[in-house]
Structure formats: structure tokens, C-alpha cells
């Protein structure tokens, strides 16, 4: 038994040593964030294992003082979602003694209304502002220097509208050192970790965006006032443009910000000649006035892949050839949708055939495909020698996208006998539950019943087959109960079965001469019982006329009368 | 002298769970089934299932199969019942009974032993 | 399951008085079981297999019954008879007792 494993919180981390009683949990929050709830859970020992405290959550909090910050980031509440009205949040940067502060926007974007973001040079409300988004339209690309070590943060929202917010990344550097540079989505490489003069860095995107504005490669410059000689670039999901790299990935404009409206983006991607396209579509959120469209080619003349509009869940794409051509249509008219809408599609390299890679034998067991070529439709059938099983799916199909509808499955030791099943008017006892080599089942009849065949079954293994049980599963009768007497067969009549005794169930039949007929039931049965009885009086044949009854009645002068019969069993 | 010999009375928390025992003397440990019947107000006596000492088999009423969980130590003549994620309606008396295979009765009783859950 | 429905569920008697207590069953069962139990006691068999008395069962008891209805009968109630009798049944898995019928001396 054991602890459930803690939710991850959202914008942060947790790190288990063990889910078993003693084992504990450690939650971390992503930069920016403030964990709210205990950071150490333990498990504790129970009937069931329970964590002794509710799992943490990550929250953006509005305003705090950071004292010796060095790097991280501060976002306003409910960030990337919208932050709430009537917010007034201060943070205070502090860099450590002897270092100043440096400021880069990921994201600014308030609600037009009076909602308003002020960073000061300075530790108070008081100090000087360096940014006022009243003042500035536009963001500093190059981001904010602090004189000393200080930066105090304003955001003020008012009573409507609301937006993403924002989120600001800190740097603290040292005296003769530039600030460590950032780009969003993207990475850098630097020569030096503390970057002091002479530090080259090496900025590049992280797959599908595309650097612009400024330099791939920067220097910090000026011993006596040390800073980057050119302005950091930026990534940006771009609207078309020619990739020729053997994978990569597509991003919607702008990507995860919202795509703008009316625009018309073509993207080509070139692989090796032999080879064609797998497009792995793994978000696909756009309008329904949108139109995504991949073309099987290297123009918008090839034979369509695929037209979609509006969102749809993860799929996949292959192209015959090397080329495919991808085309985005936003709606001018519309207006855009919100974070992280749009489309997001790696791609990959594959091998150019038209069947589905092949498949391997299988310990244990065997495979039969349909047809030798492997084309789209083919099945491949897997079994198991005896003794075996298959252990997931036995039957796999080429699709159309050429590749197998199932994993591979395994064939496994079957180290068990089925279930034996229940028995009518029995219980049964089980020694093992799953019926492994060596249970045995039981069966004992209810009251009243009686068992034919074996009462105790067990499960022995085999040199070549699957384990078995040593007999087959009982029965249990209902109670031999004592048999009804035989009846005379009516006079002019007949009966079958003529017997002395009829068991418990049986039915006995009666019939007439010809010239008579039956008075009474033609059918009548022992009913079981203590004691088993005849379930009706036996009948009569009586004369279908007059005429008939006088001739059989002098045929009978000299014969005694019937015995009267009993209708109960012999005891 | 056939005697069942159970286990003295038990306060247990709900959600806790319970293991009583029934020491059988005066006959053959593995001849007979040990079988457990609940006693309470509410619903009379009922049938929580039975265990073949000399193979482990067991079989449950239904109602109680998960609840309850019969096991024996052959070694010394002792069988067992566990009751789980207790509740105050499990409160009751508990007895073991023996029985045989073709007896359909419970021929001889322990003295039963008191479960109270309670918090 | 067969639920079984004893009448009546308490009687009383006066010593020397004949006694008859029954147990009817939902559906048809081969043979029914009794026992006596005392307050603060366990119960012990009494009748088993619808008729046949368990050991040291005084001869005043008997049992009877056939399908869906039998009954316990005391030729002359004493007072150590007072106690609740319970049938139960095992024609059907699982086994079932009746309510038990509870009888005091007058």
C-alpha cells in the first residue's frame, strides 16, 4: 500500500523519494512563482497511506519584496491567464551589495483602459519612474539598467477589462559586467558565465522560430561603463519561409501569441530527395473562418494532404515525395483568438517506400501477415506456442499512413489455468484468486444436490501447453428422489414406457384402440417430491359409439375388473 | 470436547481494520470447515464465508467480499478473520462455526467476540 | 439469496402449553436447520435436516416441514425452553437464518 503520487503543481515541480510510508515529497515553483501550502509532504502510514498535508499550489503573487536577487522573473497574478480588477501590487528588487539591476520585458500587455505598470529607479514609491506604460507605447527592447541596486515595480488595475499582465525578467551584475542576456524562446551560449568584458554570447531559437532584429552574436564592450555592443535579438514564430532541415518544427504567426488577422503564410519544407514527410500535428486550435492546408509537393499546385478549419485533436501527415508546401489563411474579419491558439507541427524525415516498415519475429511465438508485401491494408496476424499467450494485441494493420495500428505484442508464460467457473447449486472455495500452478478450487453442492464428478480441481503445469486443470468442473444433480409406481394402461388402451417403476420427472403416455377415445390427460408425470407422486388420475379409452361400446362390453364378460392403481410412490 | 476458543472484544476507529481469531480444540483441525457468521439487530445472523483448513480455499457470501478476508495457521489450530475500512455499521458480534462438508448446519459455536467502531 | 421469514417474531407460553413457531422460505428449499440461542450466549444447533434433534435436544422438540414451509413444535413448553430459536436454510448459496423467533415463558 501506498501514497497516490502528488499532483505537479502548475508552474512548478515536485520531486518524490518514495510513495511508500516515511517517503516524502518536495514541491518547487517555477521563477516568478510563490508556493502556497507546505513545500515537504511525508507519507504517512494508514490502512491506506495518506500524505500528512494537502499538495501545494504555485501562485503568482501580487507584489513582494525580492531581496538579494540575482536572476528570476516577477509576473503579475493569475499569469499567463489575466490577472483580476482592482489590483495594486509593488515588488522591490534588491540586488546584492556592490551590483545593479538590469530589467528585460518577456510580456507587457494591460488592458487599455486605466490599468498601468510603472518601474522605478529606485526602492519606493517615490523614486523615479524609467518605464510608465501611460507614457511609452512601445516596450525597450533593450530592457531597463538601475542606477543602483534597486528596482520597485507598479502595477495598478482598475474596475474593468483585463489582460495577460505581464512578466519581467530580473538580472543583478556585478561592477565591470554586463546583465546576463535573455531571449524568449530561444537559448544563448556564452564564453564566460559572468559575462565581464570581452564575454561574447551566441544567441539561437528553439525549433520553429526564426531570430530577428538585432545580432546572433553580441560583446560586452566598455571597461569603464561595460555593455552588450549590440541590442539582443529576438525569436519570433514568423508568417512563411523555406526550411531544409531534416526535422523541425511549424509554428503558427506569432506563436503563442495570438496569429494576426488577414494574413496569408506559405511554408516550404525540402527534405533529402529518396525521402518524404511525416507531419506530426500536435495543435491545431484555429478559427473557423481560418484555413490550415498541406499540398503533397513543393507549390500550391500539388495534390491536397489535408484542409482543416477550426480546432482539431493531435494527428498525423505523410507526404508521397520530399516537398510539402504548408498554407495558413487567417480571416480578415474576424477577430483573433486568444494564447497559445494557433497550430504548432513538427516534422520529420523518413524513408521513402510504400509499405510499412517491417515487422520482427516474436520470442515464443510466430507471425502470419495477410500478403508478403507489406502495403497499406495488410494485417499481420501473431501467435503464441503452446504454453504461452499474447500479451497485447495480436492483430496489427498497415494503415494508410503506413505506419502499424498496434505496438508489437509479447507472448508470455501462462502460468496459470482459466477461471473454472461456477457450478448451478454449488459454492465453491478457491485457494488463489488468479489460479496460478498448484490452486485448487472446491465445489460443494447446496442442500439438496448431489455432486457427479470431481469436487476438488487443481492446476498443474505442463511440459508443452498451458497449465490445466486435472478434471473438468462438476455438476450438482438434484437428490435422487424415490420413483412413482407404474400405472395399469386403461382398458382398450396402451401405455409407454410400460415399466413397474418411472424415476422422479418422468412422463408416462396413454392411447386407445381404435373405436375409442381417451378421457383424461393422454400425458401424465412423476412429480418429484417426498413422496414423488403422479401429477394427474391415469385415463379412460371410452367407446366413440354406442354400437362400439355394446360389442367391447361382450367381449369382457369373463374379465376381471381393473386393480385400482396407487398414486403414490413406492416408500 | 469439540471448543472454539475467539478472541476478546475490540473498540477500533472507522476506516481501521480488525483481525479476530478462533482457536479450535477437541478435533481434527483440518476435517472441518471453519466457517464466520455476523450477529447484529439489524439484520439477524449472516454468512460471511468459509475456509478449508487443510487447503486455504475459501468462499464468500457477496455482501462480504470485500470485507472481509479468512485465512489459518494450521501449526497451531488457529483461524483467522481480518475486517477492513471499518464503518459503524460492522459493529457487531462476530462468530466462528464449524462445519463439515456435508453438513449444512454450523454444529459447534465460538463465544463470539464483540467489534465496536467507534470514534 | 432465499430469505426466510419467521412468525411469530415473539411469542409466550405457559409451562405444559404445546408450542409451534414456523419458518417460511422465499422459495422452495430441501431441508431446514435450527437453533436455540440464550441471551449473552452463542447460539447452538437444535434441529438439523428439518427433523433429527442434535445431542442432549430434550425428545418435547420437533421439527417438520416440506418446500417453502416448516416449523419447530415444543410438546409442553418448560422454562428453560425460553430462548430465540433461528432456521436457516443451505438449499441456496449463501446460506440464510430467519429473523429468529423469540419465546418467553408466561
Known amino acids: 500500500l501506498s501514497c497516490h503520487f502528488p499532483r505537479r503543481p502548475a508552474y512548478g515541480d515536485v520531486t518524490v523519494t518514495s510513495l511508500h510510508p516515511g517517503g516524502s515529497a518536495r514541491f518547487h515553483c517555477a521563477t516568478g512563482y510563490q508556493l502556497k501550502g507546505a513545500r515537504h509532504l511525508t507519507c504517512l502510514n494508514a490502512t491506506q497511506p495518506f500524505w500528512d498535508s494537502k499538495e501545494p499550489v504555485c501562485i503568482a503573487a501580487c507584489g513582494g519584496v525580492i531581496r538579494n536577487a540575482t536572476t528570476g522573473r516577477i509576473v503579475s497574478p493569475g499569469f499567463p491567464g489575466n490577472y483580476s480588477n482592482n489590483l495594486t501590487c509593488h515588488w522591490l528588487l534588491e540586488a546584492p551589495e556592490g551590483q545593479r539591476l538590469h530589467l528585460h520585458f518577456e510580456k507587457v500587455s494591460l488592458a487599455e483602459d486605466d490599468d498601468r505598470l510603472i518601474i522605478r529607479n529606485g526602492d519606493n514609491v517615490e523614486a523615479p519612474p524609467v518605464y510608465d506604460s501611460y507614457e511609452v507605447e512601445y516596450l525597450p527592447i533593450e530592457g531597463l539598467l538601475s542606477s543602483g541596486k534597486h528596482f520597485f515595480v507598479e502595477l495598478s488595475t482598475d474596475s474593468s477589462g483585463a489582460a495577460a499582465g505581464m512578466a519581467l525578467r530580473y538580472e543583478a551584475f556585478q561592477q565591470g559586467h554586463c546583465y546576463e542576456p535573455f531571449v524568449k524562446y530561444g537559448n544563448f551560449s556564452s564564453s564566460t558565465p559572468t559575462y565581464p568584458v570581452g564575454t561574447t554570447v551566441e544567441f539561437s531559437c528553439d525549433p520553429g522560430y526564426t531570430l530577428e532584429q538585432g545580432s546572433i552574436i553580441i560583446e560586452c564592450v566598455d571597461p569603464h561603463d561595460p555593455q552588450w555592443n549590440e541590442t539582443e535579438p529576438a525569436c519570433r514564430a514568423v508568417c512563411s519561409g523555406e526550411i531544409t532541415d531534416s526535422a523541425g518544427v511549424v509554428l503558427s504567426p506569432n506563436w503563442p501569441e495570438p496569429y494576426g488577422r488577414g494574413q496569408d503564410c506559405i511554408w516550404g519544407v525540402h527534405v533529402e530527395e529518396d525521402k518524404r514527410i511525416m507531419l506530426d500535428i500536435r495543435v491545431l486550435r484555429i478559427g473557423p473562418g481560418d484555413v490550415l492546408t498541406f499540398y503533397d509537393g513543393d507549390d500550391l499546385t500539388a495534390r491536397v494532404l489535408g484542409q482543416y478549419s477550426g480546432p482539431r485533436s493531435h494527428f498525423k501527415l505523410f507526404t508521397s515525395m520530399a516537398d510539402v508546401t504548408i498554407q495558413f489563411q487567417s480571416d480578415p474579419g474576424t477577430s483573433v483568438l486568444g494564447y497559445q491558439q494557433g497550430f504548432v507541427i513538427h516534422f520529420f524525415e523518413v524513408p521513402r517506400n510504400d509499405t510499412c516498415p517491417e515487422l520482427p519475429e516474436i520470442p515464443n511465438g510466430w507471425k502470419s501477415p495477410s500478403q508478403p508485401e507489406l502495403v497499406h491494408g495488410t494485417v499481420v496476424t501473431y501467435q503464441c506456442y503452446p504454453g504461452y499467450q499474447v500479451v497485447g494485441s495480436s492483430v496489427l494493420m498497415c494503415q494508410w499512413d503506413l505506419t502499424w495500428s498496434e505496438d508489437l505484442p509479447s507472448c508470455q508464460r501462462v502460468t496459470s489455468c482459466h477461471d473454472p467457473g461456477d457450478v448451478e447449486h454449488s459454492r465453491r472455495l478457491i485457494s488463489s484468486p488468479k489460479f496460478p500452478v498448484g490452486a485448487t478450487v472446491q465445489y460443494i453442492c447446496d442442500q439438496g444436490f448431489v455432486l457427479m464428478g470431481s469436487s476438488i480441481l487443481t492446476c498443474h503445469d505442463r511440459q508443452a501447453g498451458s497449465p490445466k486443470w486435472s478434471d473438468r468442473a462438476p455438476k450438482c444433480l438434484l437428490e435422487q428422489l424415490k420413483p412413482c409406481h407404474g400405472l395399469s394402461a386403461p382398458e382398450n388402451g396402451a401405455r409407454s414406457p410400460e415399466k413397474q417403476l418411472h424415476p422422479a420427472g418422468a412422463t408416462i403416455h396413454f392411447s386407445c384402440a381404435p373405436g375409442y377415445v381417451l378421457k383424461g390427460q393422454a400425458s401424465i408425470k412423476c412429480v418429484p417430491g417426498h413422496p414423488s407422486h403422479w401429477s394427474d388420475p391415469p385415463p379412460i379409452c371410452r367407446a366413440a359409439s354406442l354400437d362400439g361400446f355394446y360389442n367391447s362390453r361382450s367381449l369382457d364378460v369373463a374379465k376381471a375388473p381393473a386393480a385400482s392403481s396407487t398414486l403414490d410412490a413406492a416408500h | 470436547e469439540v471448543q472454539l476458543q475467539q478472541s476478546g472484544p475490540e473498540l477500533v476507529k472507522p476506516g481501521a481494520s480488525v483481525k479476530i481469531s478462533c482457536k479450535a480444540s477437541?478435533?481434527?483441525?483440518?476435517?472441518?470447515?471453519m466457517r464466520w457468521v455476523k450477529q447484529s439487530p439489524e439484520k439477524s445472523l449472516e454468512w460471511i464465508g468459509e475456509?478449508?483448513?487443510?487447503?486455504?480455499?475459501?468462499t464468500y457470501n457477496q455482501n462480504f467480499k470485500a470485507k472481509a478476508t479468512l485465512t489459518v495457521d494450521k501449526s497451531s489450530s488457529t483461524a483467522y478473520m481480518q475486517l477492513k475500512s471499518l464503518t459503524s455499521e460492522d459493529s457487531a458480534v462476530y462468530y466462528c462455526?464449524?462445519?463439515?462438508?456435508?453438513?449444512?448446519?454450523?454444529?459447534?459455536w465460538g463465544q463470539g467476540t464483540t467489534l465496536t467502531v467507534s470514534s | 439469496q432465499i430469505v426466510l421469514t419467521q412468525s411469530p417474531a415473539i411469542m409466550s407460553a405457559s409451562p405444559g402449553e404445546k408450542v409451534s413457531m414456523t419458518c417460511s422460505a422465499s422459495s422452495s428449499v430441501s431441508y431446514m436447520h435450527w437453533y436455540q440461542q440464550k441471551s449473552g450466549t452463542s447460539p447452538k444447533r437444535w434441529i438439523y435436516?428439518?427433523?433429527k434433534l442434535a445431542s442432549g435436544v430434550p425428545a418435547r422438540f420437533s421439527g417438520s416441514g416440506s418446500g417453502s414451509s416448516y416449523s419447530l413444535t415444543i410438546s409442553s413448553m418448560e422454562a428453560e425452553d425460553a430462548a430465540t430459536y433461528y432456521c436457516q436454510q443451505w438449499s441456496s448459496t449463501p446460506p440464510t437464518f430467519g429473523g429468529g423467533t423469540k419465546l418467553e415463558i408466561k
Open positions: 462455526a464449524r462445519g463439515g462438508y456435508f453438513l449444512y448446519y454450523f454444529d459447534y
Open positions: 477437541g478435533y481434527s483441525f483440518t476435517d472441518y470447515y
Open positions: 435436516d428439518t427433523s
Open positions: 475456509i478449508n483448513p487443510s487447503t486455504g480455499g475459501t
